[in-house]
C-alpha cells in the first residue's frame, strides 16, 4: 500500500466565488474516497466534480475533486481523503 500525497489549491471562479481543487497522487491501490466537506459534512454529489482515477506512470494513481465555494467561507471547507483504512482532512489554503 502506498498512501496518497494530497494537495489543495484555489483559483478565482467568478465574482465572490472561488474554485477549490483537492488532488491526490502517488497512491496504490487505486480505490480512494475523495470528497469536499462543509462543516465536516460531505457536500452533495451534484456540487462536486471528480476526475477519473488514472495511472501516473509510476505504478501508482492520481485523481482530483473540485467544488465552487463563496469567498470568505474557506474555513468551513475541507477535503476528506480515505485510502486503505487511513483518512485525513485538508483545509483550503488562505
Amino acid at each position: 500500500t502506498v498512501p496518497p500525497m494530497v494537495n489543495v489549491t484555489r483559483s478565482e471562479a467568478s465574482e465572490g466565488n472561488i474554485t477549490v481543487t483537492c488532488r491526490a497522487s502517488g497512491f496504490y491501490p487505486w480505490n480512494i474516497t475523495l470528497s469536499w466537506r462543509q462543516d465536516g459534512v460531505s457536500l452533495s454529489h451534484d456540487t462536486q466534480q471528480w476526475g477519473d482515477v488514472l495511472p501516473d506512470g509510476n505504478g501508482t494513481y492520481q485523481t482530483w475533486v473540485a467544488t465552487r465555494i463563496c469567498q470568505g467561507e474557506e474555513q468551513r471547507f475541507t477535503c476528506y481523503m480515505e485510502h486503505s483504512g487511513n483518512h485525513s482532512t485538508h483545509p483550503v489554503p488562505s
Epitope: 470528497s35 466537506r37 462543509q38 462543516d39 465536516g40 459534512v41 460531505s42 452533495s44 454529489h45 451534484d46 467561507e73 474555513q75 468551513r76 476528506y80 482532512t89
Partner: antibody, heavy 116, light 107 residues
Amino acid sequence: VQLQESGPGLVKPSQSLSLTCNVTGYSITGDYAWNWIRQFPGNKLEWIGYIGYTGSTTYNPSLKSRVSITRDTSKNQFFLQLNSVTPEDTATYYCARWRNWAMDYWGLGTSVTVSS
Amino acid sequence: DIQMTQTPSSLSASLGDRVTISCRANQDISHYLNWYQQKPDGAVKLLIYYTSRIHSGVPSRFSGSGSGTDYSLTIANLEQEDVATYFCQQGNTPPTTFGGGTKVEIK
C-alpha cells in the same frame, strides 16, 4: 463520543424552547457538525439544523425563522432555541454528531411537551 | 424537500429469517443514503452509511445496497436484539430528510 440532551419537559405555547446538548469524548471545535433532530409522536423524524466545528450554522428552511443553535466551547456544549412554540412542536428532541455522510452518534433524546 | 418512502411500515419475522427493508427517494440521491436503528427505549444508532458502508461495531448481518432512487437494508439472520424501528436518511440534497420508519418484530 457521548451526547446528552437536557431541558424543560414542558413549555407553554408562544414561549421559547431551550435545550442543551452536553458532549463528552470529542471536542465540538475539533471537526464535524453538531445537530438537532426531533421526532414527533408517530415516529416522523425532522432535521432542525446544526452548528459546525467552526461555529457556522445551517438550518432547515422550514424552521429557519424560529430557530437558533449556539454553543459554549468552554463547556463543550451546544444549544437549541426554538421560538414561538405551538403544540405542534411537541416531540422528542435529539442531538447528534454528523460526520462526513451520516450522523454517527446520537443522544438518548429528551421529551418536550408544548401545552398550557 | 426530497421525500423518502420506506416500505413496509412494519413487519414480523422469525428468528434467523432474512429481512429486507426498502427506501425510495423521489429523485436521485447519488448513494447518499444512511440507515439507523432505533431501539424501543428511543436510542438511535447508525448502522449503514453511504448506501453500503458498515458503521464500526455493527454486526456483519446488516448490509445495505442500492443506487439512484432505490435502496435497501438487509438483516441476514434476524436476532432478538434486532427488534427495533429502522429509518433511512438521504444526505444528498439539503435539508436532509428521513423515511417514515419500519418497525421490525419477532413472530
